[in-house]
C-alpha cells in the first residue's frame, strides 16, 4: 500500500502500512516523513540514504530494538527525530552521528535507563530533549550536557528519579547562560539535597505529582533553596495519586527561591487561607491558579505585588473580591461558581480576560466596574446576560473588546461605544443583538475589525450604521438573516479589505453597494439564496477584489438570467471553489456546475 | 459491527462499538460497573494513541430512546498545564490511566441510551477515535 502524499514531493504519511523496511519509492526531495507504527525493528547504517532533504522524521512505535552506528548519517537537515514507543535494546555509540542540525529529539518510552549512556553529546544544535516515560533513576546530568549549549527544554517526567544530589547539577554551573525549562513531574521524589539547586538558573521548572506526602513536599521544596527560576509550576494531576493533606507549611521553602512567575496547577484540596499559603509569593510578577477550589474569596484583596493574576478553571463560592494595586493583567476564565460579576478595584489594570465563566453583568461597562482607567483589552466573551447600561465612561483607552457568545441587552438603545475612539477590535458575534438604531457604532473612529456574525437587524435590512468606521479593514456580517441592504451602507469604508456576507438570505446580487470599497480584497457571499442579479446590468466589483465566494447559492440557470450567468463567467478569475457553484433551478439542471453551462438561449428551448 | 461488552450493573448494561474506520484498539474497564441511580468508581483506559493527545476534546452525541440531544463538547486537555497527566501523551506512547468518577441523584427513565464519543485532538485537529456506547437501563432490575 502506498504512502499518502500530503504535500507533493515534500510530506509523506506512511503510518501503519506494515512496512518492514524504509520505502524506496519516495522522492529524494521528501522533507517530512511519518513512518510510525510500522514494524521496522532494526535501523542499519545509512538507513535514510535516499532522503537527503529530510527535516522531520517520525518513527513512533516502529518496534525498533536496534539502532546501528550511522543510522541517520548524512541527514544534515534533520531538525526533528521522533522515536516514541520503541523498545530500544541496543543503541550504538554513533547511532545519532551525522545529525548536525537536530533541534528536537523525542525518545519517550524507549527503555532508556540512563542519560549517561545516551549518545547525544555531539548534538550541539539540540534545543529540545524529551526522554519522558522511561526508566531513568539518576538525575545526574552527564558532562556532555556542557556541549548542549542550545538546550531549552529537557523533559524527564514519568521516570524513576527519587533523589537529587548536589553533584547531579554540577554541569549546569558551567552553563550559566542556559535558558533551560525542566520538567520533572511524575517522578517519585523523596529527597532533594539542600544546595543542589544553589545558584542554578532555570527558565521553567515543573514539579507535578512528585511527592506522596506533605512532609516530603515540604523538605523537597526546601531543597530547592537558592534556585533562580523564571517560572515555577507546582501541583498534581486529577488522574494520579493526590496528597491527602495540604497546608501553608508545604510552600514555606519557596521563600528561599527567586521566582518571577508561579503557577499551581490542579490540587485536589480546598484552599482556604491563601494569604498564609502564598506568603512567600507575594512579590512574584505573575501568579496563576489552575483547577483549584478556593474557599475564601476575600483574600485576593490582600496587598499582593502581582502584576499578572491568572485564575483558570477554578471553583469559587462567589466572585472573588479583587483589590490589587499593582495588577496589570487579569485572566479569569472557565471558572465555576460566583455567577454574578461584582466590582473589582484594580487601578493599574490594562488587560482583563473574563471569558467563559457564565457570568452575568447587571451593568456594563464603566471605570467603576473594574476600578481602572487604564484598560486596553477587555474580553467578556462566552458569558451570560450583560446589560449595557453605560457607555464605557473612564474606559476610553480600550483597544480590544470581545463580547462574542454572551447575551447583550440594551445594545440598540443608545450609542454604547461613543467614547471608544481608540478601539481597534470589536467582536459582538452571536450576542442576540438586534440592530434597531443607526447610531450603534458611533464613536468608533479607529475601529479596524468588526465581527458581528449571528445577530439580527430590524426588518432584516442593513442600514447605514458604519458611517464613522473609516478605518475598518475587516467586517463580518455572516448569519445575520439579512435580506436587503442600503445602497450606501458601505460608502465610508474605503479601507475595508474583507467583507463576509455569508449565511444570509439575499436572493439577488448587486455590485452597486460596493463601489466605494477601493481596498476590498475578499467578498464572501456563500450560503445565501442568490438566484440572479438585482439589476439587469451588473457593474464590476472594485478592481482590488481578489476573492469572490458565491458557493452554495440557488443559481437560476434559465434563459432569462443569461446575462447574470455570463457575468459570473466573466468573474471567473475572482471566484473561489467554483465546483461548489451549482444550479438550483430548473430541475433538469439542478446540481450542474454553473461555470460549465453553455449559456446560449437554447438553454430552455 | 463487533460489539465490545464493558460491564453489567444492577440497573445497566454497557457495551460499545467503533464508529470510525480505523478501529484502533482501546481497552476500557469500569470498576464497579456504573449504576445509573448513583455511582462512584474507577474508569481504567489502556490505549496507544495515533496522534498526540494535546488539546483533546470529545464531541458527545447522546440519544435517549431515539430522541437526539444537542451535541455537547467536552474539553479534556486545554494544551498547557492540564488536569490530566495523559494530556501530555504523545503519538505512540502507552496511555494506561485510571480516572475516578462519581455522580448521584440523577433520575434516568428506563430505556436505551446511546452516546457517540468522538475524540478529537492535535493541531491540526483530527479524529483520534470514535466509540458508540449503548447503555440499556432497567431501573428496577436486580
Amino acid at each position: 500500500e502506498p504512502c499518502v502524499e500530503v504535500v507533493p514531493n515534500i510530506t509523506y504519511q506512511c503510518m501503519e502500512l506494515n512496512f518492514y523496511k524504509i520505502p524506496d519509492n519516495l522522492p529524494f526531495s521528501t522533507k517530512n516523513l511519518d513512518l510510525s507504527f510500522n514494524p521496522l525493528r532494526h535501523l542499519g547504517s545509512y538507513s535514510f540514504f535516499s532522503f537527503p532533504e529530510l527535516q522531520v522524521l517520525d518513527l513512533s512505535r516502529c518496534e525498533i530494538q536496534t539502532i546501528e552506528d550511522g543510522a541517520y548519517q548524512s541527514l544534515s537537515h534533520l531538525s526533528t527525530l521522533i522515536l516514541t514507543g520503541n523498545p530500544i535494546q541496543s543503541l550504538a555509540l554513533g547511532a545519532f552521528s551525522g545529525l548536525s542540525s537536530l533541534q528536537k529529539l523525542v525518545a519517550v518510552e524507549t527503555n532508556l535507563a540512563s542519560l549517561e549512556n545516551f549518545p547525544i553529546g555531539h548534538l550541539k544544535t539540540l534545543k529540545e530533549l524529551n526522554v519522558a516515560h522511561n526508566l531513568i533513576q539518576s538525575f545526574k546530568l552527564p558532562e556532555y550536557f556542557s556541549n548542549l549549549t542550545n538546550l531549552e527544554h529537557l523533559d524527564l517526567s514519568s521516570n524513576k528519579i527519587q533523589s537529587i544530589y548536589c553533584t547531579d547539577l554540577r554541569v549546569l554551573h558551567q552553563m550559566p547562560l542556559l535558558n533551560l525549562s525542566l520538567d520533572l513531574s511524575l517522578n517519585p521524589m523523596n529527597f532533594i539535597q539542600p544546595g543542589a539547586f544553589k545558584e542554578i538558573r532555570l527558565h521553567k521548572l515543573t514539579l507535578r505529582n512528585n511527592f506522596d506526602s506533605l512532609n516530603v513536599m515540604k523538605t523537597c521544596i526546601q531543597g530547592l533553596a537558592g534556585l533562580e527560576v523564571h517560572r515555577l509550576v507546582l501541583g498534581e494531576f486529577r488522574n494520579e495519586g493526590n496528597l491527602e493533606k495540604f497546608d501553608k507549611s508545604a510552600l514555606e521553602g519557596l521563600c528561599n527561591l527567586t521566582i518571577e512567575e508561579f503557577r499551581l496547577a490542579y490540587l485536589d484540596y480546598y484552599l482556604d487561607d491563601i494569604i498564609d499559603l502564598f506568603n512567600c509569593l507575594t512579590n512574584v510578577s505573575s501568579f496563576s491558579l489552575v483547577s483549584v477550589t478556593i474557599e475564601r474569596v476575600k483574600d485576593f484583596s490582600y496587598n499582593f505585588g502581582w502584576q499578572h493574576l491568572e485564575l483558570v478553571n477554578c471553583k469559587f463560592g462567589q466572585f472573588p473580591t479583587l483589590k490589587l494595586k499593582s495588577l496589570k493583567r487579569l485572566t479569569f476564565t472557565s471558572n465555576k461558581g460566583g455567577n454574578a460579576f461584582s466590582e473589582v478595584d484594580l487601578p493599574s489594570l490594562e488587560f482583563l480576560d473574563l471569558s467563559r465563566n457564565g457570568l452575568s453583568f447587571k451593568g456594563c461597562c464603566s471605570q467603576s466596574d473594574f476600578g481602572t482607567t487604564s484598560l486596553k483589552y477587555l474580553d467578556l466573551s462566552f458569558n451570560g446576560v450583560i446589560t449595557m447600561s453605560s457607555n464605557f465612561l473612564g474606559l476610553e483607552q480600550l483597544e480590544h473588546l470581545d463580547f462574542q457568545h454572551s447575551n447583550l441587552k440594551q445594545m440598540s438603545e443608545f450609542s454604547v461605544f461613543l467614547s471608544l475612539r481608540n478601539l481597534i477590535y470589536l467582536d459582538i458575534s452571536h450576542t442576540h443583538t438586534r440592530v434597531a438604531f443607526n447610531g450603534i457604532f458611533n464613536g468608533l473612529s479607529s475601529l479596524e475589525v468588526l465581527k458581528m456574525a449571528g445577530n439580527s437587524f430590524q426588518e432584516n435590512f442593513l442600514p447605514d450604521i458604519f458611517t464613522e468606521l473609516r478605518n475598518l479593514t475587516f467586517l463580518d456580517l455572516s448569519q445575520c438573516q439579512l435580506e436587503q441592504l442600503s445602497p450606501t451602507a458601505f460608502n465610508s469604508l474605503s479601507s475595508l479589505q474583507v467583507l463576509n456576507m455569508s449565511h444570509n438570505n439575499f436572493f439577488s446580487l448587486d455590485t452597486f453597494p460596493y463601489k466605494c470599497l477601493n481596498s476590498l480584497q475578499v467578498l464572501d457571499y456563500s450560503l445565501n439564496h442568490i438566484m440572479t442579479s438585482k439589476k439587469q446590468e451588473l457593474q464590476h466589483f472594485p478592481s482590488s477584489l481578489a476573492f469572490l465566494n458565491l458557493t452554495q447559492n440557488d443559481f437560476a440557470c434559465t434563459c432569462e438570467h443569461q446575462s447574470f450567468l455570463q457575468w459570473i463567467k466573466d468573474q471567473r478569475q475572482l471566484l473561489v471553489e467554483v465546483e461548489r457553484m451549482e444550479c438550483a433551478t430548473p430541475s433538469d439542471k439542478q446540481g450542474m456546475p454553473v461555470l460549465s453551462l453553455n449559456i446560449t438561449c437554447q438553454m430552455n428551448k | 459491527q463487533k460489539q465490545y461488552w464493558v460491564c453489567n450493573s444492577s440497573d445497566a448494561s454497557i457495551s460499545y462499538t467503533y464508529c470510525d474506520k480505523m478501529q484502533y484498539p482501546i481497552s476500557i474497564n469500569v470498576n464497579p460497573c456504573i449504576e445509573l441511580k448513583r455511582s462512584k468508581g474507577l474508569l481504567h483506559i489502556f490505549y496507544i494513541p495515533r496522534r498526540d493527545l494535546k488539546q483533546l476534546y470529545f464531541n458527545l452525541y447522546i440519544t435517549v430512546n431515539t430522541m437526539n440531544l444537542p451535541k455537547r463538547k467536552e474539553v479534556i486537555c486545554r494544551g498547557s498545564d492540564d488536569d490530566y497527566s495523559f494530556c501530555r501523551a504523545l503519538k505512540g506512547e502507552t496511555v494506561n490511566t485510571t480516572i475516578s468518577f462519581s455522580f448521584k441523584g440523577i433520575k434516568f427513565s428506563k430505556g436505551k441510551y446511546k452516546c457517540v464519543v468522538e475524540a478529537i485532538s492535535g493541531s491540526p485537529e483530527e479524529m483520534l477515535f470514535c466509540l458508540e456506547f449503548v447503555i440499556l437501563h432497567q431501573p428496577n432490575s436486580n
Epitope: D24, G44, Y46, S50 | -
Partner: nanobody
Framework: EVQLVESGGGLVQPGGSLRLSCAAS????????MGWFRQAPGKEREHVAL????????YYADSVKGRFTISRDNAENTVYLQMNSLRPEDTAVYYC??????????WGQGTQVTVSS
C-alpha cells in the same frame, strides 16, 4: 553482495573539471538508488548527488547544483559524476554508494579529489 569501484579522482585547478565513475558488480538487480557522497577531513560524510535506478530521478546538494551532473549507464552498470567549475571547497574523498531494496547500503573504497592551484 554488491561491489563498487570508483575511479577518476585526482588533482585539478579551481575552475577545472573531473569525471568520476562508479562500476557496480554482484547483486546489482537489488540496487534501488545510487549516489555520490563526499567527506572532507574532520567533517561528516555528505550527499552530493543521487540517482534512482528505476526511473532516473535525480537529486543534487545545493552546493553542487548547476556544476555537477550525475548520470548512469545501465548497460555498463556504471554511475558517473561529471564535476565542472570545481572549487577548493570541493576537495574531499568522494564515495560511491548503493542502496538495495532491503535498505542495505554498500560503499566503494573512495577516490580523492583535490582542487588546488
Amino acid at each position: 553482495e554488491v561491489q563498487l569501484v570508483e575511479s577518476g579522482g585526482g588533482l585539478v585547478q579551481p575552475g577545472g573539471s573531473l569525471r568520476l565513475s562508479c562500476a557496480a558488480s554482484g547483486s546489482i538487480f537489488s540496487i534501488s538508488d545510487m549516489g555520490w557522497f563526499r567527506q572532507a577531513p574532520g567533517k561528516e560524510r555528505e550527499h552530493v548527488a543521487l540517482i534512482r535506478i528505476k526511473d532516473g530521478s535525480i537529486y543534487y546538494a545545493d552546493s553542487v547544483k548547476g556544476r555537477f551532473t550525475i548520470s548512469r549507464d545501465n548497460a555498463e552498470n556504471t554511475v558517473y559524476l561529471q564535476m565542472n567549475s570545481l572549487r577548493p571547497e570541493d576537495t574531499a574523498v568522494y564515495y560511491c554508494g548503493a542502496k538495495t531494496g532491503t535498505s542495505f547500503v554498500y560503499w566503494g573504497q573512495g577516490t580523492q579529489v583535490t582542487v588546488s592551484s
